[in-house]
Interface confidence: low
Amino acid sequence: QEGDFPMPFISAKSSPVIPLDGSVKIQCQAIREAYLTQLMIIKNSTYREIGRRLKFWNETDPEFVIDHMDANKAGRYQCQYRIGHYRFRYSDTLELVVTGLYGKPFLSADRGLVLMPGENISLTCSSAHIPFDRFSLAKEGELSLPQHQSGEHPANFSLGPVDLNVSGIYRCYGWYNRSPYLWSFPSNALELVVTDSIHQDYTTQN
């Protein structure tokens, strides 16, 4: 990295958790002094170019489309900027996960799915037939990799004390430590509703 420049960003325009055969758009922050931006995937500590964009005078942040997502395209991505013939800058890294490589786990809750703020709920992710060593709990609509992870089987995810932001649709995924970017099909969905008005009617769906 050159001098004290802030590290350029790299981002996915949609969720980085991508179903098999799905697509995602990746954006590299444009930097003024770069004449070429390359999107690289890092596999086994080696870089492989996925795409490149030459700089134009009216350039916005360069975008790259990854389509037909599969096991080979899952992993860590980084933008590489050419400043001169032998000078480079690099962005932060972005992790993309592909789903649909194993059978789906089952997600259940230890209580009803309509909660008041401050209450607790535990969601359990289990897989009777596939011995996953990791599970991730994802909330629909979030644009980052799920923060909730567990190495237990079954996996217990404690949410709470909850606030209104916890409301949403949740699914879990199973995966293996040895292949951290290859995830199962999503589990059944559970919709959590956090409300400070218990008098409303709420229906939850699977």
């Epitope: 098999l20 599969d70 096991a71 649909g100 194993y102 059978g103 596939i130 011995p131 099909f185 059944n188």
Partner: antibody
């Protein structure tokens, strides 16, 4: 074009083991799972098991003790091995590519007859 | 294991007819059902997954519906190539289990 082709021995003696190979093309075994299904003559379909893209397996528990599924990603081949065959294991054996946890593309099948 | 009861086991129909085949699961399978077609002398082909989604290349005259434990496959304006065997299959649980099949014959 997605294709699957089973190759098996045709005839197996009772108590012997069965080995069938499913050779695939048009897709990678690192991205898709492959199921095995069989259909005895004049009877319904029975799911045997699957080897997932990531390499783990799931089996029909009724057959689990006699069944083994493996693969060679580089050769695009999936292998079904079944031990201690009896006459009621006579069936068409099919491999099928997984799609959204189901079966989208199937092989033509290979007929296995268990007989002395 | 989940039992899939498919009906009818066979039906005689005419070109241009609309037909429905039903499958009842022994428990709620939350639309984790697919439909398969097997033409005479040929292998199987996936038609529908997740209850209602058509596989690539499947004509729009095929449609799936249902929820809970009851599902149906409807073929509108039958064409000659549609005379075949049809099977439902559930994938809510292991092991995957199939309906007994429905044979569509020309009247």
């Amino acid at each position: 074009r997605v294709q699957l082709k089973e190759s098996g021995p045709g005839l197996v003696a009772p108590s012997q083991s069965l080995s069938i190979t499913c050779t695939v093309s048009g897709f990678s075994l690192t991205s898709y799972g492959v199921h095995w299904v069989r259909q005895p003559p004049g009877k319904g379909l029975e799911w045997l098991g699957i080897i997932w893209a990531g390499g783990s397996t799931s089996y029909n528990s009724a057959l689990m003790s006699r069944l083994s599924i493996s693969k060679d990603n580089s050769k695009s081949q999936v292998f079904l091995k079944m031990n201690s065959l009896q006459t009621d294991d006579t069936a068409m054996y099919y491999c099928a590519r997984d799609h959204y946890d189901l079966f989208a593309y199937w092989g033509q099948g290979t007929l296995v007859t268990v007989s002395a | 294991d989940i039992l899939m009861t498919q009906s009818p086991s066979s039906m005689s129909v005419s070109l241009g007819d609309t037909v429905s085949i039903t499958c009842h699961a022994s428990q709620d399978i939350s639309r984790n059902i697919g439909w398969l077609q097997q033409k005479p002398g040929k292998s199987f082909k996936g038609l529908i997954y997740h209850g209602t989604n058509l596989e690539d290349g499947v004509p729009s005259r095929f449609s799936g519906s249902g929820s809970g434990a009851d599902y149906s496959l409807t073929i509108s304006s039958l064409e000659s190539e549609d005379f075949a065997d049809y099977y439902c299959v559930q994938y809510a649980q292991f092991p995957r289990t199939f309906g007994g099949g429905t044979k569509l014959e020309i009247k």
